[in-house]
């Protein structure tokens, strides 16, 4: 049954140059798990989880995006271009497709706190 | 506009195993959002879910089936196949194959079928 | 499995007629209920989803309404068209079943 929440860091920030662990995760549901999709604020793909061929970066985010933990991804090397919406789209079977949203700001200041908590958006 | 095409033997002897494709056109069967199922139907009645494939080969079966059904894919033919094994007389059916896509969160539906084929199990 | 119960299994109307099909499940499926129409030969067609939406295409005088264990197929004003077997189908539980279908004819 379609009962599932994705919880997401929520809103967080982080220092330019330094790096940021974006998580999601599914709860209250016994669907499979078949991928997870996560997309950059313009819809670009930056990186896939799928349950049968593992992981895949795109070409364009090799450098400076890593997989894990789990099924979250961590950037790193951050710019101020990086900040805005993230999504992370978990495909399941039999419930079909659930989505989460992050929002990043990537700050110039180098007391940038990296705050990060769970949240149902 | 998607099409979806079933092809193999229509005459399968009892204890043998029933193979068919269906072959997906008109669209990729590699796309993340959808899952590829068969159905079949007995002549003269209801409809009955076999399983689905996902492009990237896992599976969901029905338990009814689950002994002796393996549902594979083909990302390359853009096509996914059905296994059935040791078949009696109760397997002659109409075997249709169909996308499975969600609207918006409202779970996946049947929304793409083939035209479906029938397979006779006979001596 | 869920047991999807449908009645009556044939119904006899006139063009005009408003007709109703009615779908029971074995228990709860929230909304997750779908109904399909199927022509003699031909592959069964996506009418309404999660209960009550209307696919793409389908004329508005087909609605779906229920929720839970029991739920309805309403077609407003029948059709020469709409002379078919309808079966209802849960997809909120694993194995994905149907009902055994209603066939409307003709009176």
């Known amino acids: 049954m379609m009962t599932g929440t994705i919880e997401t860091t929520g809103n967080i920030s982080a220092k330019k140059g330094g790096s940021v662990i974006l998580q999601c995760h599914l709860s209250s549901t016994m669907a499979q798990v078949t991928q997870v999709n996560w997309e950059q604020h313009d819809h670009s793909l930056l990186a896939i989880r799928n349950a049968e061929l593992g992981w895949h970066i795109y070409p364009a985010f090799k450098d400076r995006v890593a997989p894990g933990p789990g099924l979250g991804l961590t950037l790193q090397s951050l710019t101020m271009n990086d900040t805005g919406e993230y999504f992370c789209t978990y495909h399941t079977y039999p419930d079909g497709t659930y989505r989460g949203r992050i929002f990043l700001e990537v700050l110039e200041s180098s007391v940038a706190e990296h705050s990060a908590r769970f949240q149902i958006p | 506009q998607l099409q979806l095409q079933e092809s193999g033997p229509g005459l399968v002897k009892p204890s043998e195993t029933l193979s068919l494709t269906c072959t997906v056109s008109?669209?990729?069967?590699?796309?993340?959002?959808?899952?590829w199922g068969w159905i079949r139907q007995p002549p003269g009645k209801g409809l009955e879910w076999i399983g689905s494939i996902y492009y990237s080969g896992s599976t969901f079966y029905n338990p009814s089936f689950k002994s002796r059904v393996t549902i594979s894919v083909d990302t390359s033919k853009n096509q996914f196949s059905l296994k059935l094994s040791s078949v009696t007389a109760a397997d002659t059916a109409v075997y249709y194959c169909?996308?499975?896509?969600?609207?918006?969160?409202?779970?996946?539906?049947?929304?793409?079928w083939g035209q479906g084929t029938l397979v006779t199990v006979s001596s | 499995d869920i047991q999807m119960t449908q009645s009556p299994s044939t119904l006899s109307a006139s063009v005009g007629d408003r007709v109703t099909i009615t779908c029971r499940a074995s228990?709860?499926?929230?909304?997750?209920l779908a109904w399909y129409q199927q022509k003699p030969g031909k592959a069964p067609k996506l009418l309404i989803y999660k209960a009550s939406s209307l696919e793409s295409g389908v004329p508005s005088r087909f609605s779906g309404s229920g929720s839970g264990t029991e739920f309805t197929l309403t077609i407003s004003s029948l059709q020469p068209d709409d002379f078919a077997t309808y079966y209802c189908q849960q997809y909120g539980i694993l194995p994905r079943t149907f009902g055994g279908g209603t066939k409307v004819e003709i009176k």
């Open positions: 008109g669209g990729s069967i590699s796309s993340s959002l959808y899952y």
């Open positions: 228990q709860s499926i929230s909304s997750w």
């Open positions: 169909a996308r499975e896509a969600g609207r918006g969160t409202t779970g996946l539906l049947f929304d793409y």
